[in-house]
């Protein structure tokens, strides 16, 4: 008996061929011997089966001795053995209909789990293999689960269902809702304006939700909310903003925050969380601010950085166009009795300058000793 695999919601065409290449009488029945359809001359006739409104044939093929049964909008319960009776012969076709669906929604937050559930007819024992957009293969039976979804899991998942050495392929589009970057770091000189941007890695027609930037300043004993906001159809409205610092927020996407000036007391790290309408859970993006200050107090030239710096970063003080006078893997360096000229404070990572601040040291004129 021939086996045909079908997909829930699709259309399937079961073939039945006579040896004579002409229109002759045929009938399609199910395993209960209930007539589905047939012909009377050149007319299509239908029986009392449940498929009545979804069953059809192709009259244009009858003259060639082909009498297909077309079933539209397939259901799992359409799985059955179908019998074509033509020329005193019986052709049996076993139809197995499968469905594959994502757990609840195909739009999932980063870090959430994706569960794919296979609907299959009783008595079948299919195996499923799915390939993610990044080429990761997962296998299973009735359910397949992928925990901790990542941004790279966005796209078309291709799943193959195998049964009786036949296969049927499903394609499911998954959108992982996330920020483009999990973390970012901004390096600024003291007094400079700071721009924080939080671009999303997905586009949807209507984006509604709410969010907050929660900040832990390096110098502060506890963290606090810097700003809370609402998002309605991609329009941003500020709900509450702390008085210090007085952050400003752009009214359109991408989410954009401006800190009027970088100050040592603001250096630290923050977490922007975004809750989306009809989703439980939140999107997160970490943001870090490193602030540099170069000062000269009497005979001491000092350069300091505040904020989350990696231990491999190098802080240096050098006179312009000369070798570094001091270079350390520390957050503060200084030079006593610096010579006159333009001094540079540099924060660098493996030779790449991340932040630079210049300070001019004026010559110190020694006052003549009074006779």
């Amino acid at each position: 008996k021939k086996v045909v695999l079908g997909k829930k919601g699709d259309t399937v065409e079961l073939t039945c061929t006579a040896s004579q290449k002409k229109s002759i009488q045929f009938h399609w029945k199910n395993s209960n011997q209930i007539k589905i359809l047939g012909n009377q001359g050149s007319f299509l006739t239908k029986g009392p089966s449940k498929l009545n409104d979804r069953a059809d044939s192709r009259r244009s093929l009858w003259d060639q001795g082909n009498f297909p049964l077309i079933i539209k909008n397939l259901k799992i319960e359409d799985s059955d053995t179908y019998i074509c009776e033509v020329e005193d012969q019986k052709e049996e076709v076993q139809l197995l209909v499968f469905g594959l669906t994502a757990n609840s929604d195909t739009h999932l937050l980063q870090g959430q789990s994706l569960t794919l559930t296979l609907e299959s007819p009783p008595g079948s024992s299919p195996s499923v293999q799915c390939r993610s957009p990044r080429g990761k293969n997962i296998q299973g039976g009735k359910t397949l689960s992928v925990s901790q979804l990542e941004l790279q899991d966005s796209g078309t998942w291709t799943c193959t269902v195998l049964q009786n050495q036949k296969k049927v392929e499903f394609k499911i589009d998954i959108v992982v809702l996330a920020f483009q970057k999990a973390s970012s770091i901004v390096y600024k000189k003291e007094g400079e304006q700071v721009e924080f941007s939080f671009p999303l890695a997905f586009t949807v027609e209507k984006l509604t939700g709410s969010g907050e930037l929660w900040w832990q300043a390096e110098r502060a004993s506890s963290s606090k909310s810097w700003i809370t906001f609402d998002l309605k159809n991609k329009e941003v409205s500020v709900k509450r903003v702390t008085q210090d610092p007085k952050l400003q927020m752009g009214k359109k996407l991408p989410l954009h925050l401006t800190l009027p000036q970088a100050l040592p007391q603001y250096a630290g790290s923050g977490n922007l969380t975004l809750a989306l309408e009809a989703k439980t859970g939140k999107l997160h993006q970490e943001v870090n601010l490193v602030v540099m200050r170069a000062t000269q107090l009497q005979k001491n030239l000092t350069c300091e950085v505040w904020g989350p710096t990696s231990p491999k970063l190098m802080l240096s003080l050098k006179l312009e166009n000369k070798e570094a006078k001091v270079s350390k893997r520390e957050k503060a360096v200084w030079v006593l009795n610096p010579e006159a000229g333009m001094w540079q404070c540099l924060l660098s990572d493996s030779g790449q300058v991340l932040l630079e601040s210049n300070i001019k040291v004026l010559p110190t004129w020694s006052t003549p000793v009074q006779p």
Epitope: S210, K224, T228, D230, Q243, A275, E277, K282
Partner: antibody, heavy 119, light 107 residues
């Protein structure tokens, strides 16, 4: 350790006045919005009023508007609730609360002070 | 004003049971929702903020979900100390409002 200690509650006649105080410690008081929340005996919670970090914005529930005034003194780390024209329905434990939680949640509560309005 | 309706007003359970409390807002409040626990004679304690985030130090058997108008607080496995009263509260717009409370009682 964050601490909020209310005082000033007591028995007062209808139409009378009372001033509640809340002494805050263990955090930078001037950096947080503060609220008063009350609970009538055997009943649920009712938010009464709140005040911005510098005292420039204040919000009240309709039932106390024009009768109660929320204020703060950041130099003294103190929050106040001036209650005038008191009614029997104002009888409740009044809590001083910090609005310091993420997503505007009320993260620290005092132990409460009982206000009883009765003749 | 936004009305917050909690249900049920009381629920009975045994140690180890799973309990779900729901809170419905009269209009959409996005995720501006918090859940509090109150023990008799004590001040309320914050459990969940932003509808689904667990406050630091709160046991993981407590979880919150929902957004918009419908929210739930779930206690996955009741412990003896959980048989108290729970309140939801919206922080979407003033005046902030609380649900009427749900008392979790021993069966």
């Amino acid at each position: 350790e964050v601490q909020l200690v209310e005082s000033g509650g007591g028995l007062v006649q209808p139409g009378g006045s009372l001033r509640l105080s809340c002494a805050a410690s263990g955090f930078t008081f001037s950096s947080y919005w503060m609220s008063w929340v009350r609970q009538a005996p055997g009943k649920g919670l009712e938010w009464v009023a709140n005040i911005k970090e510098d005292g420039s914005d204040k919000y009240y529930v309709d039932s106390v508007k024009g009768r109660f005034t929320i204020s703060r003194d950041n130099a003294k780390n103190s929050l106040y609730l001036q209650m005038n024209s008191l009614r029997a329905e104002d009888t409740a434990v009044h809590y001083c609360v910090r609005e310091g939680g993420q997503w505007l949640a009320l993260d620290y509560w005092g132990q409460g002070t009982l206000v009883t309005v009765s003749s | 004003d936004i009305q917050m309706t909690q249900s049920p007003s009381s629920v009975s359970g045994s140690v180890g049971d799973r309990v779900t409390i729901t809170c419905r807002a009269s209009q959409g409040i996005s995720s501006w929702l918090a859940w509090y626990q109150q023990k008799p004679g004590k001040a309320p304690k914050l459990l969940i903020y932003g509808a689904s985030s667990l406050q630091s130090g709160v046991p993981s058997r407590f979880s919150g979900s929902g957004s918009g108008t419908d929210f739930t607080l779930t206690i996955s496995s009741l412990q003896p100390e959980d048989f108290v009263t729970y309140y939801c509260q919206q922080a979407n717009s003033f005046p902030w409002t609380f649900g009427q409370g749900t008392k979790v009682e021993i069966k």
